[in-house]
């Protein structure tokens, strides 16, 4: 990722910039953007970044708001890299079974599952 | 989802079935399946279920192992439904900004980010 700061620091900085520029971002009162209904955020990264693209195209650029969108695009690069790592390594069934057990365990304990 | 039990109970039952049928599942020693390198599971649902499909096609069916794969296909249906809900609702920028802040906050605290 072409960034000099670690991804974790990048996310923190982006959160701060989002707060700073909130008023400017929400200025367009007619614009509508898809917002996921649930909180399983990782399932929705594609839609979230499409929404960011829509927002960027409608926001007056300049100053640190540009930095916000630059950061968001670096975060997208990081997530795309993580997605690539989902399917790159072909392992034995043994390891896949262990991973599947972990995945289901996480679904069981951490996912927000509607009844 | 065409299932009489809630998704959370379905996941628990599937975890138990996975343990029960482990020996049968790992019998194929030559089969290789993509295993994600990281633990951001929700980013990898597509690859995980492709792997499950590969495993199912190579596993002798019958008895409760069929129930395992049936359950996994119901879990996939649930996740596909969640994915659909990522982009169905078009909201104002205000709500999108709130969701983006939440997404970045979750990334900051809960995601497994490599340094």
């Amino acid at each position: 990722i072409p960034t000099e700061i670690p991804t974790s620091a990048l996310v923190k900085e982006t959160l701060a910039l989002l707060s700073t520029h909130r008023t400017l971002l929400i200025a367009n009162e007619t614009l509508r953007i898809p917002v996921p209904v649930h909180k399983n955020h990782q399932l929705c990264t594609e839609e979230i970044f499409q929404g960011i693209g829509t927002l960027e195209s409608q926001t007056v650029q300049g100053g640190t708001v540009e930095r916000l969108f630059k950061n968001l695009s670096l975060i997208k690069k990081y997530i795309d890299g993580q997605k690539k790592k989902c399917g790159e390594e072909r392992r034995r069934v043994n390891q896949f079974a262990d991973y599947l057990q972990e995945f289901l365990g996480v679904m069981n304990t951490e996912w927000i599952i509607e009844s | 989802i065409p299932t009489e039990i809630p998704t959370s109970a379905l996941v628990k039952e599937t975890l138990a079935l996975l343990s029960t049928h482990r020996t049968l599942l790992i019998a194929n020693e030559t089969l290789r399946i993509p295993v994600p390198v990281h633990k951001n599971h929700q980013l990898c649902t597509e690859e995980i279920f492709q792997g499950i499909g590969t495993l199912e096609s190579q596993t002798v069916q019958g008895g409760t192992v069929e129930r395992l794969f049936k359950n996994l296909s119901l879990i996939k249906k649930y996740i596909d439904g969640q994915k659909k809900k990522c982009g169905e609702e078009r909201r104002r920028v205000n709500q999108f900004a709130d969701y983006l802040q939440e997404f970045l906050g979750v990334m900051n605290t809960e995601w497994i980010i490599e340094s």
Epitope: K85, R91, Q95, D98, G105 | P36, V37, I112
Partner: antibody, heavy 119, light 107 residues
Framework: QVQLVQSGAEVKKPGASVKVSCKAS????????INWVRQAPGQGLEWIGY????????RYNQKFKGRATLTVDKSTSTAYMELSSLRSEDTAVYYC????????????WGQGTLVTVSS | DIQMTQSPSSLSASVGDRVTITCKAS??????LSWIQQKPGKAPKTLIH???RLIDGVPSRFSGSGSGQDFTLTISSLQPEDFATYYC?????????FGQGTKVEIK
């Protein structure tokens, strides 16, 4: 920086048990599997098993199954390896090692713990 | 279990020499092999993973190659600090297994 710090040397009698600890720091403990490897004096390396701190799931080398128990304490970011029914051939240096990713190479090793089994 | 056969078990070489160590797996392990260096009384240190990927901070004189069953570790120009024992490790299947080691000694 990322570190695995193991407990000190132990001397045990045959038939006893030993519990070796491995304290992780510098990273999120639940993100990486912890493997245990041993090395008898003048011998090579032997994999005992791994534990996934994310879900407490462990997997053992069949050779150690029933005698080795891998556990973690998430609150202190510590992994443990307990070996029971000790015999003289269990005299070895025991290492913990972190998986870089799921079922991946060992990117960080502990300094080792010498366990001596002697009557 | 997958057997890992390393050769030679020991070798004598001089500073500046090119050294090659081989490792043969009893079955196909794809490229899930790492090379580990251990100095006397010290903890092991991984040098190479996935057969040919050098770990950050490891000098470029170390290189790995191979896939399937046959693997090689090469030290292009041996340095004084390279005198140690080298192990291969397959992490393709459980139980993970190591080669018996190759001791690189000063000639």
């Amino acid at each position: 920086q990322v570190q695995l710090v193991q407990s000190g040397a132990e001397v045990k009698k045959p038939g006893a048990s030993v519990k070796v600890s491995c304290k992780a720091s510098g990273y999120t403990f639940t993100n990486h599997h912890i493997n245990w490897v041993r090395q008898a004096p003048g011998q090579g390396l032997e994999w005992i098993g791994y534990i996934n701190p994310y879900n407490d799931y462990s997997r053992y080398n069949q050779k150690f199954k029933g005698r080795a128990t891998l556990t973690v304490d998430k609150s202190t970011s510590t992994a443990y390896m307990e070996l029971s029914s000790l015999r003289s051939e269990d005299t070895a240096v025991y290492y913990c090692a972190r998986d870089y990713g799921n079922f991946w190479y060992f990117d960080v090793w502990g300094q080792g713990t010498l366990v001596t089994v002697s009557s | 279990d997958i057997q890992m056969t390393q050769s030679p078990s020991s070798l004598s070489a001089s500073v500046g020499d090119r050294v090659t160590i081989t490792c043969k797996a009893s079955q196909d392990i794809n490229s899930y092999l790492s090379w580990i260096q251990q100095k006397p009384g010290k903890a092991p240190k991984t040098l190479i993973h996935r057969a040919d990927r050098l770990i950050d901070g490891v000098p470029s004189r170390f290189s790995g190659s191979g896939s399937g069953q046959d693997f090689t570790l090469t030290i292009s120009s041996l340095q004084p600090e390279d005198f140690a024992t080298y192990y291969c490790l397959q992490y393709d299947d459980f139980p993970y297994t190591f080669g018996q080691g190759t001791k690189v000694e000063i000639k």
